[in-house]
């Protein structure tokens, strides 16, 4: 159940070069520096565990620094293809080609990846966000336009010794930051290629990846302060549940999201919310430095364990799915917004979930491991927490099985 | 700054519709939703509605569903009303308002005056 | 829907002079209530949110009471610049509701 046998090559425990390599915060995605082309042009890329593609903005847009200037590039390859993307809510398309990309922070390779060069996009870079292009981590099987697209971190493997294996330390403030804040703060890890023992404390429980597209997870119970919501465990994982970086909220099945809301504001009665707060309208404030974290409860997932009739669970507490924001008008106080939202598309594990744990997507092994990491915030009463074993039947009924359709959710 | 600059006046005919717009700046426009109020003159402030900016979520005052409708255009940072069927009971002053805690920020009001 | 009432239309003050503007809900609320302040022919100025906290940069002759379904706004020392209309609004539960007004004259 636990990472405790002899490690293997490529997870040395420590990769000091990688570690705090990642900055930026919840609300508006966590970004790596990456060089594109030769000579090499320096972006800042989201982390997106969500998506599969490459795509770097390569046009001028309002909300873009700089950009991907493919002609300045000696080793650009054109493929002579399009991409178009479309979401929810807004696109993004552009021009597919090939190039040599590394990570400075990051494994000292160069490989040769697939870039999609975004021409045009509609609510999709974010103004003030500092990162000119995405890092589509998950599988070839929800590339854009087909699966035929080999995603970055495949074409990383094949090309290098790097171990078929990332993990992500997302680090939360715990405060709201300015511009000027967010660009000196650390915002975290992505360590490429192994595991580093010093962004966690305690062990590592896995949970499989049902299948290879999304980073797709079940949830077999949840626990609003150790209270079960007593659903069936398929409602958790209507119609998926995944664990996307590039999400801010943990968004929840619209009867997941209800029952969750439901238990929450009954245990945190002793204040009366607007009902605009569990919408995500309006913000919660207190005077600086009285909030009441301890009116509001834990929030446990369980996720299956590596072993048959086996769970563990993840609990996370109010300093994560209550995201502190920054509002000129009430600057005096504390002020947050409620994280948790309704979701038409499954469970999405986003940065509110991910904040509170070190995630190991060790795809060499089909599997995601979550410890308690060591740059979640909590206070001196409670703390993020990963237990287990625990005892569960019949987990594999809580899986839905989604009938065929191509679909996307990028970035929701 | 945060700011929320409308559209200016509007004189229309009576059973026809208007647009108004409301241009924000001074904050990042995704992560707060637009309100829109109406004032008549001796009538208070009534809430139309509003939009979440992030996902073109609305939710309406059940009064107004059928009148008003809202969109936004985040390349833009703008946010839209549409008023359609226009009579003289739609003669007001239109605010948006951006929510925080309750509305910390109004537009500067656009006057519509239906008149034939 | 919530009704929220203003009692008093118009209220008569003069500079210097305490005033309190009252308002009630038809309903609990908690203290999700706000106060703003619109000067002729100008839009609302939100002075007050969770009954009692002053926005930033409203002068702190401006406060704000009550929880539940009775709430009171409180100018004191009114100033002549205070003339104005006042408005309370709960945010508790859709649909928003404002109520009436109240029309501060000063002497």
């Known amino acids: 159940e636990t990472d405790e046998e002899p490690e293997e090559p490529g997870r040395r425990g420590s990769f000091v070069e990688m570690v705090d390599n990642l900055r930026g915060k919840s609300g508006q995605g966590y970004y790596v520096e990456m060089t594109v082309g030769s000579p090499p042009q320096t972006l800042n890329i989201l982390v997106d565990t969500g998506s599969s593609n490459f795509a770097v903005g390569a046009a001028p847009h309002p909300f873009l620094h700089r950009y991907y200037q493919r002609q300045l590039s000696s080793t650009y390859r054109d493929l002579r293809k399009g991409v178009y993307v479309p979401y929810t809510q807004g696109k993004w398309e552009g021009e597919l080609g090939t190039d040599l990309v590394s990570i400075p922070h990051g494994p000292n390779v160069t490989v040769r990846a697939n870039i999609a060069a975004i021409t045009e996009s509609d609510k999709f870079f974010i103004n003030g966000s500092n990162w000119e292009g995405i890092l589509g981590l998950a599988y070839a099987e929800i590339a854009r336009p087909d699966d035929s697209l080999e995603p970055f971190f495949d074409s990383l493997v094949k090309q290098t010794h790097v171990p078929n294996l990332f993990s992500l330390q997302l680090c939360g403030a715990g405060f709201p930051l300015n511009q000027s804040e967010v660009l000196a703060s650390v915002g975290g890890s992505m360590i490429i290629g192994g595991i580093d023992h010093s962004l966690y404390t305690g062990s590592l429980w896995y949970t499989p990846i049902r299948r290879e597209w999304y980073y797709e997870v079940i949830i077999v119970r949840v626990e609003i302060n150790g209270q079960d919501l007593k659903m069936d465990c398929k409602e958790y994982n209507y119609d998926k549940s995944i664990v996307d970086s590039g999400t801010t909220n943990l968004r929840l099945p619209k009867k997941v999201f209800e029952a969750a809301v439901k238990s929450i504001k009954a245990a945190s009665s002793t204040e009366k919310f607007p009902d605009g707060f569990w919408l995500g309208e309006q913000l919660v404030c207190w005077q600086a430095g009285t909030t009441p974290w301890n009116i509001f409860p834990v929030i446990s997932l369980y996720l299956m364990g590596e072993v048959t009739n086996q769970s563990f669970r993840i609990t996370i507490l109010p300093q994560q799915y209550l995201r502190p924001v920054e509002d000129v008008a009430t600057s005096q106080d504390d002020c947050y917004k409620f994280a948790i939202s309704q979701s038409s598309t499954g469970t999405v594990m986003g940065a509110v979930i991910m904040e509170g744990f070190y995630v190991v997507f060790d795809r060499a092994r089909k599997r995601i491991g979550f410890a308690v990491s060591a740059c979640h915030v909590h206070d001196e009463f409670r703390t993020a927490a990963v237990e287990g074993p625990f005892v569960t039947l019949d987990m594999e009924d809580c899986g839905y099985n989604i009938p065929q359709t191509d679909e996307s959710t990028l970035m929701t | 700054e945060v700011q929320l600059q409308q559209s200016g006046a509007e004189l229309v005919r009576p059973g026809t519709s208007v647009k108004l717009s409301c241009k924000a700046s001074g904050y990042t426009f995704t992560s707060y939703w637009i309100h829109w109020v109406k004032q008549r003159p001796g009538q208070g402030l009534e809430w139309?509605?509003?939009?979440?900016?992030?996902?073109?979520?609305?939710k309406y005052n059940q009064k107004f569903k059928d009148k008003a409708t809202l969109t936004v255009d985040t390349s833009s940072s703008t946010t839209y009303m549409h008023l359609s069927s226009l009579t003289s009971e739609d003669s007001a002053v239109y605010y948006c308002?951006?929510?925080?805690?309750?509305?910390?920020?109004w537009g500067q009001r656009t006057l519509v005056t239906v008149s034939a | 829907d919530i009704v929220m009432t203003q009692s008093q239309k118009f209220m008569s003050t003069s500079v210097g002079d305490r005033v309190s503007v009252t308002c009630k809900a038809s309903?609990?609320?908690?203290?999700?209530v706000a106060w703003y302040q619109q000067k002729s022919g100008q839009s609302p100025k939100a002075l007050i949110y969770?009954?009692?906290h002053r926005y930033s940069g409203v002068p702190d002759r401006f406060t704000g009471s009550g929880s539940g379904t009775d709430f009171t706004l409180t100018i004191s020392n009114v100033q002549s610049e205070d003339l104005a209309e006042y408005f309370c609004?709960?945010?508790?539960?859709?649909?928003?509701?404002f109520g009436g007004g109240t029309k501060l004259e000063i002497k």
């Open positions: 609004q709960q945010y508790n539960s859709y649909p928003y509701t």
């Open positions: 309903q609990n609320v908690g203290t999700n």
């Open positions: 308002a951006r929510s925080g805690v309750a509305f910390p920020y």
């Open positions: 969770s009954a009692s």
């Open positions: 139309i509605g509003m939009i979440d900016p992030s996902d073109s979520y609305t």
